[in-house]
Interface confidence: low
């Protein structure tokens, strides 16, 4: 008499989350009489998945009619697969008795569940940094399976190499998470730059998921200051301008000081944007020279984005001044923390 075989033809089956999985099982003989049961896992802790005779298994249906005479196909279909369904499934033949006795098990079919990674979420630094500094961006994606995944970082289309990536957990799990940190060196031209975290996974059919972050949220471009005197006007008034250029973000306060005393304070608002995303601002101060006996020391003081003030000073010569002075006289710089970025 030929020995009974329990045949599970697929060693492994991979199914996308939400789909149905078909687990095939046939037996080579109708003898001896007795039921077939499906289990997940082996040994004493195995979990009963399907038993034709009793129990309620709403997501499991037999592929062919198991009550049909001479049926030797005990394949099952599990609907609405989730990552929690992953594992090795065994088709087991029992000999009828009181109780039924386990006779033979199939070799097992490993069910792996392909679950898509969540959309990558990119977060940047909590505080802004200036050009030449390095900032870190973090990208996270969760809930994917299998574990194999690729994450790449790009800045303006160029792949970044200073990257550290971890996939958790290290061991077997129903689903996995990835976390990656990229270090980016800022340049002054990065106001319009973007970093992209690109996640490729078998479930995505070649269309990677992308998360983005704008470097405008991470960068501070400090201003360049220049104070110049325009021509003396006929009414003995001197027009002094303070040009504040190439700064980002727009949050900026400018204060004029005459001989150390606050003359006027202004806040930047609704400025036009330069092509590179930075801003320029020009402030004017009219000084009545005839109201002063001595030279006037004018200071343009700029506080940008909560940083320490930057100063540029200019001395207007009062004594023996001619009616016309040369235009666009460059200022002296007394700002100790001036950043000349050209």
């Amino acid at each position: 008499e030929e020995e009974l075989q329990v045949i599970q033809p697929e060693k492994s089956v991979s199914v996308a989350a939400g789909d149905s999985a078909t687990l095939n099982c046939t037996v080579s003989s109708l003898i001896p009489v007795g039921p077939i049961q499906w289990f997940r896992g082996a040994g004493p802790g195995r979990e009963l998945i399907y038993n034709l005779k009793e129990g309620h298994f709403p997501r499991v249906t037999p592929v062919s009619d198991p009550t049909k005479r001479n049926n030797m196909d005990f394949s099952i279909r599990i609907s609405n697969i989730t990552p929690a369904d992953a594992g090795t499934y065994y088709c087991v033949k029992f000999r009828k008795g009181s109780p039924d006795v386990e006779l033979k098990s199939g070799a097992g079919t490993e069910l792996s569940v392909r679950a898509k990674p969540s959309a990558p979420v990119v977060s940047g630094p909590a505080v802004r940094a200036t050009a030449e500094h390095t900032v870190s961006f973090t990208c996270e994606s969760h809930g994917f399976s299998p574990r194999d995944i690729t994450l790449k970082w790009f800045k303006n289309g160029n792949e970044l190499s200073d990257v550290q990536t971890n996939v958790d957990p290290a061991g077997k799990s129903v689903s996995y998470s990835i976390r990656s940190t990229a270090r980016v060196v800022l340049t002054r031209r990065d106001v319009h730059s973007q970093v992209i975290c690109e996640v490729a996974h078998v479930t995505l059919q070649g269309d990677p998921l992308r998360g983005t972050a704008n470097l405008s949220e991470a960068i501070r471009v400090p201003p360049f200051l220049e104070v110049t005197q325009q021509s003396m006007r006929a009414d003995n008034q001197v027009n002094v301008t303070c040009q504040v250029t190439k700064f980002y973000p727009q949050r900026l306060q400018l204060t004029w000081l005459e001989n150390g005393n606050v003359s006027r304070t202004e806040m930047a608002s609704a400025l036009p944007e330069n092509k590179d995303g930075t801003y320029n601002w020009t402030s004017w101060l009219l000084v009545n020279v005839s109201a002063h006996r001595d030279d006037v020391k004018l200071t343009c003081q700029v506080e940008h984005d909560g940083q320490p003030a930057v100063n540029k000073s200019f001395s207007v010569k009062v004594s023996a001044h001619p009616k016309e002075q040369g235009s666009n006289t460059a200022a002296e710089n007394t700002g100790t923390n001036e950043r000349n970025i050209y």
């Epitope: 194999d148 690729t150 289309g157 078998v202 059919q205 070649g206």
Partner: antibody
Amino acid sequence: QIQLVQSGSELKKPGASVKVSCRARGYTLTDYAMNWVRQAPGQGLEWMGFINTYTGEPTYAQGFKGRFVFSLDTSVSTAYLQIGSLKAEDTAVYYCARTRGYYDFDGGAFDYWGQGTLVTVSS
Amino acid sequence: DIQMTQSPSSLSASVGDRVTITCRASQNVGTHLAWYQQKPGKAPKSLIYSASYRYIGVPSRFSGSGSGTDFTLTISSLQPEDFATYYCQQYNTYPLTFGQGTKLEIK
């Protein structure tokens, strides 16, 4: 360093068959799909199809079904292109090219190319 | 099949020139477009994927742009080693198709 190393030039008679090999170096063959591209003398590039290196399933472009067979031997990290019943018009350089993207078992953008294998069919 | 049409078919330029090659798809291919460079007797070299992403090691003078049906490859300042034939390729729909190529020659 990643390389796709193809077998050398072949001179065949019409009606014969040829098998071109493409060995993957520097990465795991089964992690990326492998495409085949034909370039006839003085002509442009023509996609022949690809093989899913994970499952071994080939996909052929129209015009490359029947006489053309893509296969794998993962034990030696090699993909193969076999052409049967060779014709004069099969004379071309055949390239293997890897699909960009880990686990992209699809035709796609190609990041690495083999150096090409010239197959000449002449009586 | 999606037809890919490159223009011009050939062009002459000098070292230092800025050169633009265009590629038009007969149907929308999103950003599933790649660019390759091929020199005589050599295998193609991959330059750009996803319409605008440069591969590692590709000089920054090469840039790609476009989406949908119209795409461009720009070489900002031609170098002697850039004289070659350039191909675009769509990978949005099977069969994958290439443009007929643009031959860039020294003036």
